[in-house]
Amino acid sequence: REEEKPFRDCADVYQAGFNKSGIYTIYINNMPEPKKVFCNMDVNGGGWTVIQHREDGSLDFQRGWKEYKMGFGNPSGEYWLGNEFIFAITSQRQYMLRIELMDWEGNRAYSQYDRFHIGNEKQNYRLYLKGHTGTAGKQSSLILHGADFSTKDADNDNCMCKCALMLTGGWWFDACGPSNLNGMFYTAGQNHGKLNGIKWHYFKGPSYSLRSTTMMIRPLDF
Protein backbone atom coordinates (compact mmCIF):
# COMPACT_ATOMS: atom_id res chain seq x y z
CA ARG A 1 0.00 0.00 0.00
CA GLU A 2 1.00 3.64 -0.42
CA GLU A 3 3.20 5.05 2.28
CA GLU A 4 1.17 7.35 4.55
CA LYS A 5 1.74 11.00 3.81
CA PRO A 6 2.55 13.18 6.82
CA PHE A 7 -0.08 15.68 7.92
CA ARG A 8 0.40 19.13 6.40
CA ASP A 9 -2.22 20.70 8.66
CA CYS A 10 -5.18 19.85 10.89
CA ALA A 11 -7.41 19.25 7.87
CA ASP A 12 -5.18 16.31 6.94
CA VAL A 13 -5.35 15.13 10.54
CA TYR A 14 -9.15 15.26 10.50
CA GLN A 15 -9.42 13.53 7.16
CA ALA A 16 -7.20 10.73 8.48
CA GLY A 17 -9.91 10.01 11.03
CA PHE A 18 -8.66 11.96 14.03
CA ASN A 19 -11.73 14.02 14.95
CA LYS A 20 -10.92 14.97 18.55
CA SER A 21 -9.63 18.48 19.28
CA GLY A 22 -6.12 18.47 20.70
CA ILE A 23 -2.43 18.72 19.98
CA TYR A 24 -1.10 17.05 16.84
CA THR A 25 2.19 17.11 14.98
CA ILE A 26 2.18 18.45 11.44
CA TYR A 27 4.86 18.49 8.76
CA ILE A 28 4.85 21.78 6.89
CA ASN A 29 6.37 22.08 3.42
CA ASN A 30 9.85 23.64 3.41
CA MET A 31 10.14 23.57 7.19
CA PRO A 32 13.00 21.46 8.56
CA GLU A 33 11.23 20.36 11.73
CA PRO A 34 7.71 19.08 12.45
CA LYS A 35 5.50 21.43 14.46
CA LYS A 36 3.07 20.75 17.28
CA VAL A 37 -0.20 22.61 16.82
CA PHE A 38 -3.63 22.64 18.39
CA CYS A 39 -6.28 21.25 16.06
CA ASN A 40 -9.86 22.41 16.55
CA MET A 41 -12.05 19.56 15.33
CA ASP A 42 -15.32 20.94 16.73
CA VAL A 43 -15.99 24.35 15.19
CA ASN A 44 -17.78 24.52 11.84
CA GLY A 45 -16.87 21.06 10.65
CA GLY A 46 -13.42 20.83 12.24
CA GLY A 47 -10.04 20.55 10.56
CA TRP A 48 -8.85 23.92 11.83
CA THR A 49 -5.17 24.62 12.54
CA VAL A 50 -4.97 27.10 15.41
CA ILE A 51 -2.37 29.81 14.79
CA GLN A 52 -3.17 32.02 17.79
CA HIS A 53 -4.97 31.60 21.10
CA ARG A 54 -5.60 33.87 24.08
CA GLU A 55 -7.58 32.82 27.12
CA ASP A 56 -6.13 33.81 30.48
CA GLY A 57 -3.27 36.30 30.17
CA SER A 58 -0.67 33.72 31.26
CA LEU A 59 1.60 34.42 28.30
CA ASP A 60 3.38 37.66 27.44
CA PHE A 61 2.60 38.70 23.86
CA GLN A 62 4.80 41.82 23.94
CA ARG A 63 7.66 40.25 22.05
CA GLY A 64 10.07 41.05 19.26
CA TRP A 65 10.25 40.18 15.59
CA LYS A 66 12.27 36.97 16.03
CA GLU A 67 9.84 35.52 18.54
CA TYR A 68 6.81 36.34 16.41
CA LYS A 69 8.71 34.82 13.49
CA MET A 70 9.32 31.44 15.15
CA GLY A 71 6.38 31.40 17.56
CA PHE A 72 6.01 31.19 21.31
CA GLY A 73 3.82 29.68 23.99
CA ASN A 74 2.31 26.21 24.10
CA PRO A 75 -0.42 24.87 21.83
CA SER A 76 -2.19 23.48 24.89
CA GLY A 77 -2.84 27.04 26.05
CA GLU A 78 -1.96 30.54 24.88
CA TYR A 79 0.34 30.68 21.88
CA TRP A 80 1.40 32.24 18.60
CA LEU A 81 2.30 29.62 16.00
CA GLY A 82 4.94 31.80 14.36
CA ASN A 83 4.88 33.89 11.20
CA GLU A 84 7.36 31.65 9.42
CA PHE A 85 5.09 28.66 9.99
CA ILE A 86 1.94 30.59 9.04
CA PHE A 87 3.67 31.67 5.83
CA ALA A 88 4.82 28.13 5.07
CA ILE A 89 1.42 26.56 5.76
CA THR A 90 -0.52 29.08 3.71
CA SER A 91 1.91 28.63 0.83
CA GLN A 92 0.97 24.93 0.59
CA ARG A 93 -2.56 25.51 -0.73
CA GLN A 94 -5.42 28.01 -0.43
CA TYR A 95 -6.65 28.65 3.10
CA MET A 96 -9.51 30.35 4.85
CA LEU A 97 -9.22 32.06 8.23
CA ARG A 98 -11.69 31.93 11.09
CA ILE A 99 -11.40 34.06 14.21
CA GLU A 100 -13.40 33.12 17.30
CA LEU A 101 -13.92 35.83 19.91
CA MET A 102 -15.49 36.07 23.34
CA ASP A 103 -16.14 39.16 25.44
CA TRP A 104 -16.25 39.41 29.23
CA GLU A 105 -20.02 39.13 29.23
CA GLY A 106 -19.81 35.69 27.67
CA ASN A 107 -20.92 36.77 24.18
CA ARG A 108 -19.28 34.85 21.36
CA ALA A 109 -18.73 35.99 17.80
CA TYR A 110 -16.62 35.10 14.82
CA SER A 111 -15.15 36.59 11.67
CA GLN A 112 -14.32 34.40 8.70
CA TYR A 113 -12.29 35.11 5.56
CA ASP A 114 -12.56 33.05 2.37
CA ARG A 115 -8.91 33.58 1.52
CA PHE A 116 -5.97 34.06 3.85
CA HIS A 117 -2.23 33.99 3.39
CA ILE A 118 0.76 36.04 4.43
CA GLY A 119 3.91 37.06 2.63
CA ASN A 120 7.41 35.93 3.54
CA GLU A 121 9.76 37.66 5.94
CA LYS A 122 11.17 39.93 3.23
CA GLN A 123 7.58 41.06 2.65
CA ASN A 124 7.17 41.68 6.40
CA TYR A 125 4.67 38.83 6.54
CA ARG A 126 2.16 41.04 4.75
CA LEU A 127 -1.47 40.06 5.27
CA TYR A 128 -3.65 39.04 2.31
CA LEU A 129 -7.38 38.55 2.86
CA LYS A 130 -10.59 38.25 0.86
CA GLY A 131 -14.26 37.63 1.53
CA HIS A 132 -15.24 38.63 5.05
CA THR A 133 -18.34 37.18 6.76
CA GLY A 134 -19.38 36.53 10.34
CA THR A 135 -21.06 37.83 13.48
CA ALA A 136 -18.22 39.97 14.85
CA GLY A 137 -19.27 43.04 12.88
CA LYS A 138 -20.46 43.79 9.38
CA GLN A 139 -17.09 45.28 8.51
CA SER A 140 -13.77 43.52 8.76
CA SER A 141 -11.59 44.34 11.74
CA LEU A 142 -8.58 43.06 9.84
CA ILE A 143 -7.12 45.31 7.16
CA LEU A 144 -8.40 43.98 3.83
CA HIS A 145 -6.16 46.11 1.62
CA GLY A 146 -3.04 44.55 3.09
CA ALA A 147 -0.87 45.48 6.06
CA ASP A 148 2.65 44.51 7.08
CA PHE A 149 3.38 42.83 10.40
CA SER A 150 4.96 45.03 13.08
CA THR A 151 6.53 44.29 16.44
CA LYS A 152 8.08 46.47 19.13
CA ASP A 153 11.44 46.23 17.33
CA ALA A 154 10.14 46.33 13.74
CA ASP A 155 7.96 49.31 12.86
CA ASN A 156 6.24 48.52 9.55
CA ASP A 157 2.92 50.30 10.11
CA ASN A 158 1.39 53.30 8.35
CA CYS A 159 1.38 55.57 11.39
CA MET A 160 3.57 58.47 12.45
CA CYS A 161 3.54 56.54 15.69
CA LYS A 162 4.96 53.11 16.51
CA CYS A 163 1.80 51.02 16.82
CA ALA A 164 3.38 47.86 18.20
CA LEU A 165 5.17 49.77 20.95
CA MET A 166 2.16 51.85 21.88
CA LEU A 167 -0.54 49.20 21.58
CA THR A 168 1.73 46.26 22.53
CA GLY A 169 2.09 42.94 20.74
CA GLY A 170 2.92 42.04 17.17
CA TRP A 171 0.16 42.54 14.62
CA TRP A 172 -0.79 43.66 11.14
CA PHE A 173 -1.11 47.30 12.17
CA ASP A 174 -2.18 50.07 9.84
CA ALA A 175 -2.44 53.35 11.72
CA CYS A 176 -3.06 51.53 13.89
CA GLY A 177 -6.09 49.73 12.47
CA PRO A 178 -9.28 48.23 13.87
CA SER A 179 -7.82 45.18 15.58
CA ASN A 180 -5.03 43.78 17.69
CA LEU A 181 -5.58 40.29 19.03
CA ASN A 182 -2.07 40.21 20.48
CA GLY A 183 -2.54 43.19 22.79
CA MET A 184 -2.41 43.28 26.57
CA PHE A 185 -4.73 40.91 28.42
CA TYR A 186 -6.99 42.80 30.83
CA THR A 187 -9.26 41.06 33.32
CA ALA A 188 -12.98 41.79 33.81
CA GLY A 189 -13.61 45.30 35.09
CA GLN A 190 -10.22 46.49 33.86
CA ASN A 191 -10.97 45.81 30.21
CA HIS A 192 -12.75 49.05 29.25
CA GLY A 193 -11.12 52.18 27.83
CA LYS A 194 -7.86 50.46 26.93
CA LEU A 195 -5.80 51.56 23.95
CA ASN A 196 -3.53 48.53 24.11
CA GLY A 197 -5.93 45.69 24.86
CA ILE A 198 -7.12 42.73 22.81
CA LYS A 199 -9.21 44.60 20.27
CA TRP A 200 -11.68 43.73 17.52
CA HIS A 201 -13.22 47.11 16.71
CA TYR A 202 -16.35 46.03 14.87
CA PHE A 203 -17.29 43.57 17.60
CA LYS A 204 -16.80 45.59 20.80
CA GLY A 205 -15.49 49.01 19.81
CA PRO A 206 -12.12 50.76 19.83
CA SER A 207 -11.11 50.31 23.45
CA TYR A 208 -12.74 47.13 24.78
CA SER A 209 -10.30 44.34 25.62
CA LEU A 210 -11.63 40.85 24.89
CA ARG A 211 -11.59 37.76 27.10
CA SER A 212 -10.55 35.12 24.60
CA THR A 213 -9.53 34.82 20.97
CA THR A 214 -8.64 31.99 18.60
CA MET A 215 -7.29 32.38 15.09
CA MET A 216 -7.44 29.25 12.97
CA ILE A 217 -6.98 28.28 9.36
CA ARG A 218 -8.33 25.51 7.13
CA PRO A 219 -7.88 24.65 3.45
CA LEU A 220 -10.48 26.11 1.14
CA ASP A 221 -11.18 22.70 -0.39
CA PHE A 222 -11.74 20.92 2.95
Partner: antibody, heavy 122, light 112 residues
Protein backbone atom coordinates in the same frame (compact mmCIF):
# COMPACT_ATOMS: atom_id res chain seq x y z
CA UNK B 1 1.44 60.94 1.04
CA UNK B 2 -1.09 62.34 3.51
CA UNK B 3 -2.39 65.74 2.45
CA UNK B 4 -4.95 68.14 3.91
CA UNK B 5 -5.64 71.04 1.57
CA UNK B 6 -7.74 73.89 2.93
CA UNK B 7 -9.85 76.53 1.23
CA UNK B 8 -12.61 79.03 1.94
CA UNK B 9 -10.93 81.69 4.07
CA UNK B 10 -11.22 85.39 3.49
CA UNK B 11 -12.44 88.71 4.82
CA UNK B 12 -16.00 88.84 6.12
CA UNK B 13 -18.09 91.38 8.02
CA UNK B 14 -19.23 90.73 11.60
CA UNK B 15 -22.48 88.78 11.74
CA UNK B 16 -21.89 87.18 8.32
CA UNK B 17 -21.07 83.59 7.43
CA UNK B 18 -18.19 81.67 5.90
CA UNK B 19 -17.60 78.01 5.06
CA UNK B 20 -14.17 76.42 5.30
CA UNK B 21 -13.27 73.22 3.48
CA UNK B 22 -10.50 70.68 3.98
CA UNK B 23 -9.85 68.16 1.18
CA UNK B 24 -8.08 65.01 2.35
CA UNK B 25 -5.97 62.59 0.31
CA UNK B 26 -3.38 59.87 0.83
CA UNK B 27 -5.27 58.00 3.56
CA UNK B 28 -8.61 56.37 4.31
CA UNK B 29 -10.48 59.52 5.34
CA UNK B 30 -13.52 57.64 6.66
CA UNK B 31 -11.40 55.95 9.34
CA UNK B 32 -10.21 59.11 11.09
CA UNK B 33 -11.61 61.66 13.48
CA UNK B 34 -11.00 65.23 12.31
CA UNK B 35 -10.59 68.55 14.11
CA UNK B 36 -10.51 72.27 13.52
CA UNK B 37 -7.92 74.27 15.45
CA UNK B 38 -7.42 78.02 15.19
CA UNK B 39 -4.71 80.55 15.91
CA UNK B 40 -5.45 84.25 16.37
CA UNK B 41 -2.77 86.58 14.95
CA UNK B 42 0.32 86.44 17.15
CA UNK B 43 -1.40 84.11 19.62
CA UNK B 44 -1.36 80.44 20.56
CA UNK B 45 -3.39 77.45 19.37
CA UNK B 46 -7.04 76.92 20.31
CA UNK B 47 -9.09 73.80 19.62
CA UNK B 48 -12.40 74.60 17.92
CA UNK B 49 -14.30 71.44 16.98
CA UNK B 50 -14.13 67.66 16.50
CA UNK B 51 -16.06 65.16 14.38
CA UNK B 52 -15.69 61.39 14.63
CA UNK B 53 -14.90 59.18 11.64
CA UNK B 54 -18.55 58.43 10.87
CA UNK B 55 -19.77 61.89 11.84
CA UNK B 56 -21.88 60.52 14.69
CA UNK B 57 -19.97 62.30 17.47
CA UNK B 58 -19.37 66.05 17.41
CA UNK B 59 -17.87 68.45 19.95
CA UNK B 60 -17.41 72.23 19.99
CA UNK B 61 -15.45 74.70 22.07
CA UNK B 62 -17.75 76.87 24.20
CA UNK B 63 -16.55 79.94 22.32
CA UNK B 64 -18.11 78.74 19.03
CA UNK B 65 -21.01 76.56 20.21
CA UNK B 66 -24.28 77.45 18.50
CA UNK B 67 -22.52 79.45 15.78
CA UNK B 68 -20.18 76.96 14.09
CA UNK B 69 -21.11 73.63 12.53
CA UNK B 70 -18.59 70.91 11.69
CA UNK B 71 -19.46 68.28 9.08
CA UNK B 72 -17.82 65.78 6.78
CA UNK B 73 -18.53 64.00 3.52
CA UNK B 74 -16.66 60.70 3.53
CA UNK B 75 -17.61 60.03 -0.10
CA UNK B 76 -15.82 63.24 -1.07
CA UNK B 77 -12.98 62.92 1.47
CA UNK B 78 -13.84 66.37 2.76
CA UNK B 79 -14.22 68.16 6.08
CA UNK B 80 -16.16 71.40 6.52
CA UNK B 81 -16.63 74.17 9.05
CA UNK B 82 -19.69 76.36 8.60
CA UNK B 83 -19.15 79.58 10.54
CA UNK B 84 -22.19 81.78 11.21
CA UNK B 85 -22.63 84.99 13.22
CA UNK B 86 -18.94 85.70 12.94
CA UNK B 87 -17.28 88.04 15.45
CA UNK B 88 -14.07 90.02 15.44
CA UNK B 89 -12.62 87.58 17.96
CA UNK B 90 -13.04 84.74 15.45
CA UNK B 91 -10.28 86.30 13.34
CA UNK B 92 -7.60 83.62 13.08
CA UNK B 93 -5.81 81.14 10.91
CA UNK B 94 -7.96 77.99 10.89
CA UNK B 95 -6.29 74.59 10.59
CA UNK B 96 -7.92 71.27 9.89
CA UNK B 97 -6.13 68.44 11.66
CA UNK B 98 -6.36 64.66 11.49
CA UNK B 99 -6.23 62.31 14.44
CA UNK B 100 -2.90 60.52 14.75
CA UNK B 101 -4.67 57.16 15.09
CA UNK B 102 -7.59 55.75 13.14
CA UNK B 103 -10.92 54.43 14.45
CA UNK B 104 -11.61 57.37 16.76
CA UNK B 105 -8.79 56.66 19.15
CA UNK B 106 -7.53 60.13 19.87
CA UNK B 107 -3.97 60.74 20.95
CA UNK B 108 -3.42 64.05 19.19
CA UNK B 109 -3.05 65.57 15.75
CA UNK B 110 -0.90 63.58 13.36
CA UNK B 111 -1.35 65.81 10.33
CA UNK B 112 -2.34 69.45 9.78
CA UNK B 113 -3.63 71.41 6.83
CA UNK B 114 -1.75 74.46 5.60
CA UNK B 115 -4.16 76.82 7.36
CA UNK B 116 -6.55 79.41 6.00
CA UNK B 117 -6.93 82.96 7.30
CA UNK B 118 -10.36 84.21 8.33
CA UNK B 119 -10.57 87.94 8.96
CA UNK B 120 -13.74 89.31 10.54
CA UNK B 121 -13.78 93.07 10.09
CA UNK B 122 -16.20 95.82 9.16
CA UNK C 1 -11.04 73.46 31.28
CA UNK C 2 -7.56 72.16 32.04
CA UNK C 3 -4.95 74.93 32.15
CA UNK C 4 -1.59 74.11 30.60
CA UNK C 5 1.31 76.30 31.77
CA UNK C 6 4.59 76.30 29.88
CA UNK C 7 7.91 77.73 30.99
CA UNK C 8 9.93 79.50 29.90
CA UNK C 9 7.93 81.47 27.35
CA UNK C 10 11.12 82.51 25.59
CA UNK C 11 14.19 80.34 25.25
CA UNK C 12 17.37 81.68 23.62
CA UNK C 13 19.82 78.82 23.00
CA UNK C 14 23.28 78.49 21.53
CA UNK C 15 23.50 75.87 18.76
CA UNK C 16 24.85 72.58 20.11
CA UNK C 17 23.63 73.34 23.62
CA UNK C 18 20.74 71.49 25.30
CA UNK C 19 17.31 73.01 25.87
CA UNK C 20 14.44 72.10 28.15
CA UNK C 21 10.80 73.20 28.22
CA UNK C 22 8.45 72.53 31.12
CA UNK C 23 4.70 71.99 30.86
CA UNK C 24 2.43 71.81 33.90
CA UNK C 25 -1.25 70.91 33.90
CA UNK C 26 -3.88 71.99 36.41
CA UNK C 27 -5.00 68.34 36.79
CA UNK C 28 -3.36 64.97 36.31
CA UNK C 29 -3.16 63.88 32.68
CA UNK C 30 -2.90 60.18 33.50
CA UNK C 31 -5.86 58.76 31.60
CA UNK C 32 -7.85 55.71 32.70
CA UNK C 33 -6.35 53.96 29.65
CA UNK C 34 -2.97 54.08 31.40
CA UNK C 35 -1.38 56.75 29.23
CA UNK C 36 -0.55 60.39 29.77
CA UNK C 37 -2.43 62.06 26.92
CA UNK C 38 0.13 64.81 26.45
CA UNK C 39 1.62 65.84 23.11
CA UNK C 40 4.31 68.28 22.05
CA UNK C 41 4.11 70.25 18.79
CA UNK C 42 6.55 72.52 17.02
CA UNK C 43 5.35 75.38 14.86
CA UNK C 44 8.18 76.66 12.71
CA UNK C 45 7.93 80.24 11.41
CA UNK C 46 5.25 80.53 8.71
CA UNK C 47 4.31 76.83 8.92
CA UNK C 48 1.57 74.64 10.37
CA UNK C 49 2.31 72.88 13.66
CA UNK C 50 3.90 69.44 13.50
CA UNK C 51 3.73 66.59 15.98
CA UNK C 52 6.94 65.87 17.88
CA UNK C 53 5.95 63.72 20.85
CA UNK C 54 2.73 61.81 21.58
CA UNK C 55 1.51 60.16 24.77
CA UNK C 56 4.07 62.04 26.83
CA UNK C 57 7.22 60.31 25.70
CA UNK C 58 6.82 58.72 22.25
CA UNK C 59 8.67 60.36 19.39
CA UNK C 60 6.67 60.69 16.16
CA UNK C 61 8.14 59.20 12.98
CA UNK C 62 10.74 61.40 11.35
CA UNK C 63 11.45 63.37 14.52
CA UNK C 64 15.20 63.44 15.29
CA UNK C 65 16.25 61.51 18.37
CA UNK C 66 17.66 64.65 19.95
CA UNK C 67 14.05 65.36 20.97
CA UNK C 68 12.69 63.51 24.00
CA UNK C 69 9.62 63.81 26.18
CA UNK C 70 9.20 62.76 29.78
CA UNK C 71 6.93 63.20 32.78
CA UNK C 72 3.69 61.92 34.22
CA UNK C 73 0.65 63.25 36.01
CA UNK C 74 0.94 67.04 36.00
CA UNK C 75 4.60 67.69 35.16
CA UNK C 76 6.08 67.15 31.72
CA UNK C 77 9.32 68.11 30.01
CA UNK C 78 10.48 68.36 26.42
CA UNK C 79 14.24 68.14 26.02
CA UNK C 80 16.45 68.84 23.04
CA UNK C 81 19.88 67.32 23.62
CA UNK C 82 21.70 69.57 21.13
CA UNK C 83 19.82 72.44 19.57
CA UNK C 84 20.20 73.00 15.83
CA UNK C 85 19.26 76.06 13.80
CA UNK C 86 16.29 74.23 12.26
CA UNK C 87 14.71 73.78 15.72
CA UNK C 88 13.63 77.42 15.98
CA UNK C 89 9.93 78.04 16.37
CA UNK C 90 7.20 77.88 18.97
CA UNK C 91 6.76 74.72 21.01
CA UNK C 92 3.34 73.82 22.38
CA UNK C 93 2.26 71.15 24.81
CA UNK C 94 -1.32 69.92 24.54
CA UNK C 95 -3.46 67.68 26.72
CA UNK C 96 -6.19 65.33 25.55
CA UNK C 97 -7.04 63.53 28.77
CA UNK C 98 -9.84 65.90 29.73
CA UNK C 99 -12.24 67.37 27.19
CA UNK C 100 -11.84 69.90 25.66
CA UNK C 101 -8.25 69.55 24.47
CA UNK C 102 -6.15 72.49 25.64
CA UNK C 103 -2.77 73.87 24.63
CA UNK C 104 -0.02 75.56 26.57
CA UNK C 105 0.67 79.17 25.68
CA UNK C 106 3.79 78.24 23.72
CA UNK C 107 7.55 78.57 24.19
CA UNK C 108 9.51 80.46 21.57
CA UNK C 109 12.90 78.93 20.95
CA UNK C 110 15.42 81.19 19.24
CA UNK C 111 19.08 80.90 18.40
CA UNK C 112 21.46 83.14 20.33
Amino acid sequence: EVQLVQSGGGVVQPGRSLRLSCAASGFTFSSYGMHWVRQAPGKGLEWVSYISSSGSTIYYADSVKGRFTISRDNAKNSLYLQMNSLRAEDTAVYYCARDLLDYDIWTGYGYWGQGTLVTVSS
Amino acid sequence: DIVMTQSPLSLPVTPGEPASISCRSSQSLLHSNGYNMLDWYLQKPGQSPQLLIYLGSNRASGVPDRFSGSGSGTDFTLKISRVEAEDVGVYYCMQGTHWPPTFGQGTKLEIK
